[in-house]
Amino acid sequence: IVLRPSRVHNSEENTMRALTLKDILNGTFSYKTFFPNWISGQEYLHQSADNNIVLYNIETGQSYTILSNRTMKSVNASNYGLSPDRQFVYLESDYSKLWRYSYTATYYIYDLSNGEFVRGNELPRPIQYLCWSPVGSKLAYVYQNNIYLKQRPGDPPFQITFNGRENKIFNGIPDWVYEEEMLATKYALWWSPNGKFLAYAEFNDTDIPVIAYSYYGDEQYPRTINIPYPKAGAKNPVVRIFIIDTTYPAYVGPQEVPVPAMIASSDYYFSWLTWVTDERVCLQWLKRVQNVSVLSICDFREDWQTWDCPKTQEHIEESRTGWAGGFFVSTPVFSYDAISYYKIFSDKDGYKHIHYIKDTVENAIQITSGKWEAINIFRVTQDSLFYSSNEFEEYPGRRNIYRISIGSYPPSKKCVTCHLRKERCQYYTASFSDYAKYYALVCYGPGIPISTLHDGRTDQEIKILEENKELENALKNIQLPKEEIKKLEVDEITLWYKMILPPQFDRSKKYPLLIQVYGGPCSQSVRSVFAVNWISYLASKEGMVIALVDGRGTAFQGDKLLYAVYRKLGVYEVEDQITAVRKFIEMGFIDEKRIAIWGWSYGGYVSSLALASGTGLFKCGIAVAPVSSWEYYASVYTERFMGLPTKDDNLEHYKNSTVMARAEYFRNVDYLLIHGTADDNVHFQNSAQIAKALVNAQVDFQAMWYSDQNHGLSGLSTNHLYTHMTHFLKQCFSLSD
């Protein structure tokens, strides 16, 4: 019997099924990545499937359990940290989330040499942050907004700060706005390379206005959550940086690091701290009007026991076309001479590239160049610099890892990842061991993600760490949508888009279109990554076409596109989504009577404005946790892009760019507005004001709130949310349930 290929194909089609919403909500098709927890040049730790903490030595090929799952289980540990001298492990349990990065936890210290937990002088609970020194086993931790130091885990603690107060003074941890919009960490303390000094930030929130919202809980009366949260134009936190000698902490106590004069003359931010050596530190400062950044290199003065920051070691970075940096101002990566450094900033053509700064920024040597952008510097060794960029084949939504040989002249460049698994892998990140002896590559797509281990000298692949075989097998009988990444050229603007098409897509047919938008400054939605998510389901099962478009204001395509939205948020981002929709209609397979748009957070703002654009293009749309007025959002983020909401600055555009101002225009669209009542980030206030404006304009709309849920709408709310949005879209598109 000879089976014809078509017969085989048909029988395969019969056994294959579309994605279901349940698949998505259950995380059936989620993938795994493998990031080694490096502890030396050739060793890493990894938590095995049975929860043992295993140490792997790449060179000997040996591995052994350093911490038993019995020990992990005895304290219900969900995380661990090995001390650099390998004598102790902290075990983290009772994880309690606070904001995006911050959480509190209980910490136990296990003594690996004695095979038991450390008793005596135990850590208080709950702790806000805890970390080992980079050498030995000193501990620094933050408890009740104060910093403590232990020379050894069993020793009594030395209290470094005493002024910590809830919602008032934060030592060693950021307040809300610094955590979310500046540092993007849960900590604000930094050990020097050999653990001699400990630097920390103190944030004074005494004068910051407080956002208050109800948390309903289960009690008779709701609780009120109070967060010092500076909205645009409001009073900001006051920051100071201190450094203490951890060997003799009581000797002179914490020493404040001076702020550069040109920064201190008006409101300012501290943006990051980088230790260079044990006695040299680099601080970055930013004016409140965020187009001037100063990098200050400070040295320890042994005679005075103080930190000196000479003006000759101040490096200014200024933007004349937008704000300083991309989303954040980039951080320096110092070279072995401990004074020169590599840093990413805009070149004369307006593309973010790696520069080498030896004396002044003006004399910086450009290391990379082209109409693409360097995105991250991973590691600088004596002879190599490893970085990521979107250069390869001119796709801005890709990430490849490159090596530049800085030890030779002229420096030569090699793409480490471009040709490894070209179809499967076009979006990489990397994790390097000490001295870049080895590294792990984590490929996020577009194919199924894969993590591999490589030799840092030869770039040879040593082994596969995680290849998601189970996922690959599970997807064999699933009809996944087709994805394509292409670009539109409109009025000298390049609009990259990703289109997700139903499995049996036929260009001669008409399909409903859903635009998924984020569109925030320095974001990127069109990326060559693997995902099986809600929009995959909508294409696979419900036959929708989904499109994501990166318009003006988005990242990694040069400053012209990025800074186009400077001081006028809510204009071009919306225009570009509308322009793209018109182009998609011209392609001939879109049913122009069934077009929707949805977005979350900034995307909720853009989708709301698009719906209220008066174009008649959109039948319906959804806004999840949208910003509705920039006066309601955080100062650090908002002012970066919009300036201040004052008459002599940019108040007019603050007022013009609200969703409420366009309430009348929602009359001819179906609008679903969704928000969590305990959103600490984009406050419920935003949606409350949209709803009020719509009611006042007598415009009908649909709404859903999620009680006690934050900006992420997690847990059971996620299931409810996506089920609810699915029903809404199917109704809008007249699809049977």
Epitope: L55, Y64, T65, I66, S68, R70, T71, S74, V75, R86, Q87, Y108, D111, L112, S113, N114, G115, E116, F117, V118, R119, G120, N121, G154
Partner: antibody, heavy 124, light 113 residues
Framework: QVQLVQSGAEVKKPGASVKVSCKTS????????IHWVRQSPGQRLEWMGG????????NYNQKFKGRVTITRDKSSSTAYMELSSLRSEDTAVYYC?????????????????WGQGTLVTVSS | DIVMTQTPLSLPVTVGEPASISCKSS????????????LAWYLQKPGQSPQLLIY???TRESGVPDRFSGSGSGTDFTLKISRVEAEDVGIYYC?????????FGGGTKVEIK
């Protein structure tokens, strides 16, 4: 049965080093840490340090730090204690003892089996 | 470091009579999380290595006669021998294993009168 058998008596000159071995049998070597305790004439028992056979990580009494080195050989289930820069006051009987590893948070164990002791005499 | 103080230094006893040794620690050996005292008693018979008698202040090691009992909590501990036998002679040591460095008492020499 459980046994901890130590190497024989040693006579050393001041400034020299001594290495005492402790060969274990009758139990799983990696389930117990090995500790070294010395007893000088007329002095109390003094804990010098210990080692976890699983990972080979030692822990030393600060008093001896820099002079004592504790190692282990997993393949022969043997622990070693080396004391350097010997002086006359190091003349003592040196014992090895085992102590069960405490995996659980509520555990903690005493030294349940001891070696027979090794007399080290430091004399010029 | 935790200092362990034993009394008496020497204890002459009569066979068949009870005996009691005291041990005090410079800080509490009671672990609040499990309500256990991290204290052990050892006996070192003449010419022999120490042998474990009691751990967790009051738990007898297997094979140890029931005439030996330990009591106390926090910083004050006692080892009792209900009826001393000739084979009980030797030096008795208390030891804390609450925290490092592990420390021993100075010892109590029990001898027959």
């Amino acid at each position: 049965q459980v046994q901890l058998v130590q190497s024989g008596a040693e006579v050393k000159k001041p400034g020299a080093s001594v290495k005492v071995s402790c060969k274990t049998s009758g139990y799983t070597f990696t389930e117990y840490t090995i500790h070294w305790v010395r007893q000088s004439p007329g002095q109390r028992l003094e804990w010098m340090g210990g080692i976890n056979p699983n990972n080979g990580i030692p822990n030393y009494n600060q008093k001896f730090k820099g002079r004592v080195t504790i190692t282990r050989d997993k393949s022969s289930s043997t622990a070693y204690m080396e004391l350097s820069s010997l002086r006359s006051e190091d003349t003592a009987v040196y014992y090895c003892a085992r102590r069960r590893i405490a995996y659980g948070y509520d555990e903690g164990h005493a030294m349940d089996y001891w070696g027979q002791g090794t007399l080290v005499t430091v004399s010029s | 470091d935790i200092v362990m103080t034993q009394t008496p230094l020497s204890l002459p006893v009569t066979v068949g009579e009870p005996a009691s040794i005291s041990c005090k620690s410079s800080q509490s050996l009671l672990y609040s999380r499990n309500q256990k005292n991290y204290l052990a008693w050892y006996l070192q018979k003449p010419g022999q290595s120490p042998q474990l008698l009691i751990y967790w202040a009051s738990t007898r090691e297997s094979g140890v006669p029931d005439r030996f009992s330990g009591s106390g909590s926090g910083t004050d501990f006692t080892l009792k021998i209900s009826r001393v036998e000739a084979e009980d002679v030797g030096i008795y040591y208390c030891q804390q294993y609450f925290s490092y460095p592990l420390t021993f008492g100075g010892g109590t020499k029990v001898e027959i009168k």
